[in-house]
Interface confidence: low
């Protein structure tokens, strides 16, 4: 600390006192000095360092009428809401002429009930799932010993004998409260009470039970929920977007999900009104009176293809001599999948039917056998996807070609020479 250059009498007539108190205490330190002539500015030191931003006030009172008479100077340093950082040795410093004078030190100490640096926080945990709680306290005076309480019951026989800063809880089956007591020579401080809400565990093994083109039946295994029965489970389904995708850990789906609630048990739900042959992502969470579990990861699922819901449209069958030209248009009804092609069946009055797989073409030319005298020839067409055939069209009779009708030129498809088959089937 700065000192006077001579063993001259100190101008300080009052030195800072000592303050010892608990956190939050408000106190004032004072220095008083009597000087002759113009009064100096008083600086405050803490542990030898000038406090540049000290909350101090200086009062100057002349003791005579002449400027050269003595002045009394009082400087007050206000400490509001005492904190650990405020503790230390305080002194006042003045410059008089070519000399520096420092007051006797005063001490600010913090002593009282323990102070919590960290307290247990409210949180939710899954039933029977381990977790940790934290509590940290300090004096002075030290030492500070901690005692944990669960539902107001101590978890150790005496402070300092149980877990200290971190409490490991192996799992809970009911919502509980935890608090922490900090003990030192001055007494006991109790932390806030943290409520640990026990939620159901995340469901496991979300899987598909069955698939239909517009319906998925899913099931899952519920997690433990402690003493609280599950009230329901919530399933969310969202259309997958190949461009975006849903990562396993992504918190929210890319669009508004379709949400369904399932009464439990059984832990199964039929999701209807879906699009056929469409990828979805699904997830499930289960709820008890305490709240919902966390969601499962998004599970990619896909509705299977269905068969077309209607037959091909506008079928026409025209005969010209020994050739028959058949053409049609794609079904207006939903295909429920990827159209793989068409099947055509034709049959005469006294001849077996013939089934043909036309692929994706919408027309075919049949080369009829013999002299073309096959009677009452009818044609049926069905569209198919990977799931199978859609409904067959009603039989369309072969009409004689009339001059003026357009008849495109097509490569010929020979009819099998000795067909004898039953009605189309796939």
């Amino acid at each position: 600390a700065p000192r006077g250059t001579q063993a001259e009498e100190s101008p300080f007539v009052g030195n800072p006192g000592n303050i010892t108190g608990a956190r939050g205490l408000t106190g004032t330190l004072r220095c008083q000095l009597q000087v002759q002539g113009e009064p100096p500015e008083v600086h405050w030191l803490r542990d030898g360092q000038i406090l540049e931003l000290a909350d101090s006030t200086q009062t100057q009172v002349p003791l005579g009428e002449d400027e050269q008479d003595d002045w009394i100077v009082v400087s007050q340093l206000r400490i509001t809401s005492l904190q650990l950082s405020d503790t230390g040795q305080y002194q006042c410093l003045v410059f008089l002429g070519h000399q520096t004078f420092v007051s006797q030190p005063g001490y600010v100490g913090l002593e009282g009930l323990p102070y919590f640096l960290e307290e247990p926080e409210d949180r939710t945990v899954a039933a029977n799932t381990p977790f940790n709680l934290s509590c940290q306290a300090q004096g002075p005076p030290e030492p500070v010993d901690l005692l944990w309480l669960q539902d107001a019951v101590p978890l150790a026989t005496a402070p300092g004998h149980g877990p200290q800063r971190s409490l490991h809880v192996p799992g809970l089956n009911k919502t509980s409260s935890f608090s922490c007591e900090a003990h030192n020579a001055k007494g006991v401080t109790t932390s806030r009470t943290a409520t640990i809400t026990v939620l159901p565990q995340q469901p496991r093994n979300l899987h598909l039970v069955s698939r239909q083109p517009t319906e998925l039946e899913v099931a899952w295994t519920p997690g433990l929920s402690g003493i609280y029965p599950l009230t329901h489970c919530t399933l969310q389904a969202v259309l997958s977007d190949d461009g975006m995708g849903i990562q396993a850990g992504e918190p929210d789906p890319p669009e508004e999900p379709l949400t369904s609630q399932a009464s439990v048990p059984p832990h199964q739900l039929r999701l209807g009104s879906l699009h056929p042959h469409t990828p979805y992502h699904i997830r499930v969470a289960c709820t008890s009176s305490q709240g919902p579990s966390s969601w499962t990861h998004w599970l990619p699922v896909e509705t299977p293809e269905g068969v077309p819901l209607g037959p091909p449209e506008n079928i026409s069958a025209t005969r010209n001599g020994s050739q028959a030209f058949v053409h049609w248009q794609e079904p207006r009804a939903p295909l429920q999948g990827t159209l793989l092609g068409y099947r055509l069946a034709y049959q005469g009055q006294d001849t077996p039917e013939v089934l043909m797989d036309i692929g994706l073409r919408q027309e075919v030319t049949l080369e009829l056998q013999g002299d073309g005298s096959v009677s009452n020839l009818t044609v049926c067409v069905a569209a198919y996807t990977a799931a199978g055939d859609g409904p067959w069209s009603l039989p369309v009779p072969l009409e004689a070609w009339r001059p003026g009708q357009a008849q495109p030129v097509h490569q010929l498809v020979k009819e099998p020479s000795t067909p004898a088959f039953s009605w189309p089937w796939w």
Epitope: L340, G341, V354, L355, M356, D357, I358, G359, R361, V364, E367, A386, A387, G388, Q411, L412, V413, K414, P416, P419, F421, S422, W423, P424, W425, W426
Partner: antibody
Framework: EVNLVESGGGVVKPGASLKLSCEAS????????MSWVRQTSDKRLEWVAS????????YYLDNVKGRFIISRENAKNTLYLQMSSLKSEDTALFYC?????????????WGQGSSVTVSS | VIVMTQSHKFMSTSVGDRVSITCKAS??????VAWYQQKPGQSPKLLIY???TRHTGVPDRFTGSGSGTDYSLTISNVQTEDLAFYYC?????????FGAGTKLELK
């Protein structure tokens, strides 16, 4: 994994009967059309018969019509070929095959075959 | 009946070569042609359907092409494991018919 296992082959005299079975696993049997295809000693493949997934539609090669019956039991995942009035020209290795989903007349998986010998 | 003709009973090749096996249909089968590979003691395996669609798991050195009545299976960079019988089949209409087969062998 798709698996097809034929059984029931053997050596018989002309005019006798024989029933082949094909046990399927690894896929939803009732969703697929199934076929029997035979292979003669000269390595030629010849389609014999086909049946729809539900079993309601059957198709036969001309020269087995009336002698062979293709059937299926979906509850048992099994395909059958009942052969009667067997002829020496029916001697072959008979394969059971699954119809491909994208074209039911193309066969995407085949069994290992069951040998049928018709000889006096 | 649609007749499928494989004009070559045998085709010789060397490892690393490119070879094309051909098949002709007696009438237009609108690309409804499948190709199968059969190795000795094994059952046939589907390689190609609808003339050019590769079946699951088939190496991309196998390529199918064709339309109308003319079809071919091309194997580029032939490997020793490709030595086998190859059959074409029309899956256009019943009765389903196969080609007589082409045996691919080493020169």
């Amino acid at each position: 994994e798709v698996n097809l296992v034929e059984s029931g082959g053997g050596v018989v005299k002309p005019g006798a009967s024989l029933k082949l079975s094909c046990e399927a696993s690894g896929f939803t049997f009732s969703n697929y059309g199934m076929s029997w295809v035979r292979q003669t000693s000269d390595k030629r493949l010849e389609w014999v018969a086909s049946i729809s997934g539900g079993g309601g539609r059957t198709y036969y090669l001309d020269n087995v019509k009336g002698r062979f019956i293709i059937s299926r039991e979906n509850a048992k995942n099994t395909l059958y070929l009942q052969m009667s009035s067997l002829k020496s020209e029916d001697t072959a290795l008979f394969y059971c095959a699954r119809g491909a989903r994208a074209s039911y007349f193309a066969m995407d998986y085949w069994g290992q075959g069951s040998s049928v010998t018709v000889s006096s | 009946v649609i007749v499928m003709t494989q004009s070559h009973k045998f085709m010789s090749t060397s490892v690393g070569d490119r070879v094309s096996i051909t098949c002709k249909a007696s009438q237009d089968v609108t690309t409804a042609v499948a190709w199968y590979q059969q190795k000795p003691g094994q059952s046939p395996k589907l390689l190609i359907y609808w003339a050019s669609t590769r079946h699951t798991g088939v190496p991309d050195r196998f390529t199918g092409s064709g339309s109308g009545t003319d079809y071919s299976l091309t194997i580029s960079n032939v490997q020793t494991e490709d030595l086998a019988f190859y059959y074409c089949q029309q899956h256009f209409t019943t009765p389903l018919t196969f080609g007589a087969g082409t045996k691919l062998e080493l020169k």
